[in-house]
């Protein structure tokens, strides 16, 4: 069964800089990736980025740079919101649309006791929704 993993990481060099990493574990080719925060895409979340393998990427503030890391994983850098604890307790969701499997989505947030740059390697997260 395909799985989606989500990892939120605070950068060691800039404590106010955060990166969301997402990946798809499964067969098939990815046709679109959507990253949202505050909830799943289309279910209370606000879109941060859309990545298409051929047509490019689209990003919304406070996203700074969305990019493909591999053919099945992406990263999204976020600007500092200016809040005292930016992005803490915030849920980030990634939805991968793949052919022929359909859409798979999972969410994650910054671990409560995050040491900058010392996040654990990405591990699969339970799938929240499969369309």
């Amino acid at each position: 069964t395909p799985e989606v993993w989500v990892q939120v990481q605070m950068e060691a060099t800039e404590l106010s800089s955060f990166t969301v990493h997402c990946g798809f574990l499964g067969p098939g080719s990815i046709s679109l990736v959507t990253v949202s925060w505050g909830g799943p895409d289309g279910a209370g979340g606000t879109k941060l980025a859309v990545l298409h393998p051929e047509l490019g990427t689209r990003q919304w503030a406070p996203a700074r740079q969305a990019r493909w890391e591999t053919q099945s994983s992406i990263s999204l850098a976020l600007e500092d919101s200016g809040a005292s604890s930016p992005f803490a307790n915030t849920t980030f969701c990634c939805k991968f649309a793949s052919f022929p499997e359909g859409s798979w989505e999972s969410c994650g947030s910054l671990p409560p006791s995050s040491d900058p740059g010392l996040s654990a390697p990405p591990t699969p997260v339970p799938i929240l929704r499969a369309d």
Epitope: G38, H52, R58, A83
Partner: antibody, heavy 123, light 111 residues
Framework: EVQLQQSGAELVKPGASVKLSCTAS????????IHWVKRRPEQGLEWIGG????????LYASKFQDMATITADTSSSTAYMQLSSLTSGDTAVYYC????????????????WGQGTSVTVSS | DIVLTQSPASLVVSLGQRATISCRAS??????????MHWYQQKPGQPPKLLIY???NLESGVPARFSGSGSGTDFTLNIHPVEAEDAATYYC?????????FGGGTNLEIK
């Protein structure tokens, strides 16, 4: 200079369809979303839907899902909105608008608007 | 859908004074320090004009007498000092989720 030029006023009969156009200049239509907004006489603004011309992705308000079809032709930098099964309640000014884009990032707000197309539905 | 309620519906302000327009959302439109609320000005026969984006950011070319503030569900547009050319209808708009919705508008009259 960024501009959105909309097609001229339309007078249509109830039940008919109309296709409005919005031609962009001064920017690359593929760099942003194009939205459509309705304004009825003496009423406020209503978002109908939008399109990402680069990806072809469309979004609609559920209220307009069945009657509005938004498309775009990147070769002519033009977005279109077709409205079908028109009723008197669809008499309004329809605006196209560009989503604010700066340094490859979008901001959800609409920073440039067309002059509006007046649609009158009357028998 | 998120409902935006603007108040007052109409406002009369003397030249040089402060105009304050409020917009209340039926649920929070903020996430982690970012507020997805925008303000527009519309004059008769013209399309809307973006004034403020993301609650407090002044759009390029808009005079500094316009300012926006707020977070969560309560937002404010301030105009100070008001000038004669500011007579218009003002709308708030959220983009926290689909569909984006607009407030009912506030008609500002200058005396």
């Amino acid at each position: 200079e960024v501009q959105l030029q909309q097609s001229g006023a339309e007078l249509v009969k109830p039940g008919a369809s109309v296709k409005l156009s919005c031609t962009a200049s001064g920017f690359n239509i593929e760099d942003t979303y194009i939205h459509w907004v309705k304004r009825r006489p003496e009423q406020g603004l209503e978002w109908i839907g939008g399109i990402d011309p680069a990806i072809g992705n469309t979004l609609y308000a559920s209220k307009f899902q069945d009657m509005a079809t938004i498309t775009a032709d990147t070769s002519s930098s033009t977005a279109y909105m077709q409205l079908s099964s028109l009723t008197s309640g669809d008499t309004a000014v329809y605006y196209c608008a560009r989503e604010r884009v700066y340094s490859n990032t979008l901001y959800y707000a609409m920073d440039y608007w067309g002059q509006g197309t007046s649609v009158t539905v009357s028998s | 859908d998120i409902v935006l309620t603007q108040s007052p519906a109409s406002l009369v302000v003397s030249l040089g004074q402060r105009a304050t327009i409020s917009c209340r959302a039926s649920k929070s439109v903020s996430i982690s320090g970012y507020s997805y609320m925008h303000w527009y000005q519309q004059k008769p026969g013209q399309p809307p004009k973006l004034l403020i984006y993301l609650a407090s950011n002044l759009e390029s070319g808009v005079p500094a007498r316009f300012s926006g503030s707020g977070s969560g569900t309560d937002f404010t547009l301030n105009i100070h000092p008001v000038e004669a050319e500011d007579a218009a209808t003002y709308y708030c708009q959220h983009s926290r989720e689909l569909p984006p919705t607009f407030g009912g508008g506030t008609n500002l009259e200058i005396k």
